[in-house]
């Protein structure tokens, strides 16, 4: 496929990535699926600068990102290394809290109202952000 050189309609370009901000809520798995079907992924935050950009666009609203520990260790959906990467958890988070009464702990990460991260029940219907890199090979064939 060809390299994607500009962002799709309704996506926002920033630092060679394209971002799409939902205005409705979905469970984490549905949000993840939506992004994949758009040839993208849930947002992966790799720097303080990217954190501030996303935070500016989402406002003080709980919003899913592409980080989870549903299979044990924390993982970014695009394979970015969690241990050595950027983190912005709230104090005492993640805590895998079981006291919510919904069964199980908390396995999916989201931006909170102040932008810092919290782990929460993956079934909660939060907004989400998709991201795709401009310089990656697109799945669409080049236009002739």
């Amino acid at each position: 496929g060809s390299e994607r050189t500009c962002c799709p309609v309704n996506w926002v370009e920033h630092e060679r990535s394209c971002y799409w901000f939902s205005r409705s809520g979905k469970a984490w798995a549905d949000a993840d699926n939506y992004c994949r079907l758009e040839d993208a992924h849930l947002v992966v935050v790799t720097s303080w600068e990217e954190q501030k950009f996303v935070q500016h666009h989402i406002g003080p609203v709980n919003t899913w990102m592409g980080l989870h520990d549903q299979n044990g260790p924390w993982k970014w959906v695009d394979g970015t290394d969690y241990e050595t990467g950027f983190k912005n958890w709230r104090p005492e988070q993640p805590d895998d809290w079981y006291g919510h009464g919904l069964g199980g702990g908390e396995d999916c990460a989201h931006f909170t109202d102040d932008g810092r991260w919290n782990d929460d029940v993956c079934q909660r219907p939060y907004r989400w952000v998709c991201e795709t890199e401009l310089d990656k090979a697109s799945q669409e064939p080049p236009l002739l």
Partner: antibody, heavy 119, light 112 residues
Amino acid sequence: QVQLQESGPGLVKPSETLSLTCTVSGGSISNYYWSWIRQPAGKGLEWIGRIDTSGITNYNPSLKSRVTMSVDTSKNQFSLKLTSVTAADTAVYYCAREGGLGATFFDYWGQGTLVTVSS
Amino acid sequence: GIVMTQSPDSLAVSLGARATIDCKSSQSVLYSSNNKNYLAWYQQKPGQPPKLLIYWASTRESGVPDRFSGSGSGTDFTLTIYSLQAEDVAVYYCQQYYRSPSFGQGTKLEIK
């Protein structure tokens, strides 16, 4: 038991708009994604797009410029519009329910409706 | 998009024998985030819509006989029908749902 039924004109003229509706019975349309898939005679299957009850959509990139999907939760229906049709759009059109689990495979299908594009 | 290629296009198998259909994707449909393969198999009989047989590459849909089995990972997948029955005559399709969904061209299964 969930049942899906496609309805709409069986004949559409070239350059016009194909419009179909899927009615869901035996269960609520809520909390699922719903897709349209088509199959030209004697050929394979092509996914057109999906919608949920809040109106969130994904479309096949190859058809995106011509497709619009909508939903009417009060009638337990969702609809497809495909503009600027040509003979290549002649096919059996199926509506289908997504299996859930954050995954776009299809566990319930309508029987399909044949749409012919011809003048 | 992801291109799905099935082989063979058609095959004839004796009743009670084993039928094997292969499906190859143009890129991996294994999601490293959850270690799941985003692949499904369907059966379609003449004049009917497709019927879901297998999802997640190897999980059998409720009510599907256990003679149907899915296997494989990454880009290479197989549907195996053990002890073929007359009612298994149909066209079989694989489908990836890792990205915008796409189907294989189909494999027509007949009785020899």
